[in-house]
């Protein structure tokens, strides 16, 4: 009948604007870690970041400088 | 939606390990830098470790430095935290974190005698 | 070590206006240490307000937003309500832009 027509079309936009949000939702949550994530620089198209380089490079430099105080680069120069 | 939910949680002693657990859905787990943050009773929040997307790169709080690690398992949605010579001031609710963006609910971890 | 600074403790009368800073014992919060704020409510899990010094997280209102105010990141509450008496962290980077992370010790905030 024209009246159960109109209820399932009504039930089906419902349902399609429900599906639509729950999508656009779980987009921008989805998205929002990872957009916070490159807009920092840590993330390139889902590999690490340089910056993780620089970070390895310095633990690796400050262990080697670590092991003998003698060698340890002084930070102020006599005058 | 992002849920990330710790377990792992428990009552050990002194000098014990612990290995801490989040399982993480609701986005692209892989693409993303993961952190752990703790809270003692009572207390701020301290940022403990992270790690990067491959899991090659690892951060520590100089407080944790050599007892805790942290890893991950790209495969299986789950982020870890083993901690090995716990100490009372180790106690604290442990969350798991997309890099200080989403948030866990926390698990307890107890370090007593 | 890098000590993160905030107030203890604020008021705000409700309809009111409050801004909550977060500064560092040495050096400025600048834009690349990428400043964030986090609410804490008796009992929850901290939850994000703002990240990358001034985005705001979803879902949370625009009566939140952060800045750089001199050498401080900054979050403004603009017509404060009963509800939003909790306490505020900030944190930021400090390893270039990346870890490690530290965080403020915090802020107690009262809506009165």
């Known amino acids: 009948s024209e009246a159960e027509d109109a209820s399932l079309l009504s039930f089906m936009q419902g349902y399609m604007k429900h599906a639509t949000k729950t999508a656009k939702d779980a987009l921008s949550s989805v998205q929002e870690s990872q957009v916070a994530q490159q807009a920092r620089g840590w993330v390139t198209d889902g590999f690490s970041s340089l910056k993780d380089y620089w970070s390895t490079v310095k633990d690796k430099f400050s262990e080697f400088w670590d092991l003998d105080p003698e060698v340890r680069p002084t930070s102020a120069v006599a005058a | 939606e992002v849920q990330l939910v710790e377990s792992g949680g428990d009552l050990v002693q002194p000098g014990g390990s612990l290995r801490v657990s989040c399982a993480a859905s609701?986005?692209?787990?892989?693409?993303?830098?993961m952190s752990w943050v703790r809270q003692a009773p009572g207390k701020g929040l301290e940022w403990v470790s992270a790690i990067n997307t491959a899991g090659t790169v690892t951060y520590y709080a100089d407080s944790v430095k050599g007892r805790f690690t942290i890893s991950r398992d790209n495969a299986k949605n789950t982020l870890y935290l083993q901690m090995n010579s716990l100490k009372p001031e180790d106690t604290a609710h442990y969350y798991c974190?997309?890099?200080?963006?989403?948030w866990g609910k926390g698990t307890l971890v107890t370090v007593s005698s | 070590q890098t000590v993160v600074t905030q107030e203890p403790s604020l008021s705000v009368s409700p309809g009111g206006t409050v801004t909550l800073t977060c500064g560092l014992s040495s050096g400025s919060v600048t834009s690349v240490t990428y400043p964030g704020w986090y609410q804490q409510k008796p009992g929850q899990a901290p939850r994000t307000l703002i990240y990358n010094t001034n985005s705001r997280f979803s879902g949370v209102p625009n009566r939140f937003s952060g800045s750089i105010s001199g050498n401080k990141a900054a979050l403004t509450i603009t017509g404060a309500l009963p509800e939003d008496e909790a306490d505020y962290y900030c944190?930021?980077?400090?390893?270039?832009?990346?870890?490690?992370?530290?965080f403020g010790g915090g802020t107690h905030l009262t809506v009165l």
């Open positions: 944190s930021v980077y400090i390893g270039g832009g990346i870890y490690p992370a530290v």
């Open positions: 609701g986005l692209t787990f892989s693409n993303i830098y």
């Open positions: 974190t997309t890099g200080e963006v989403d």
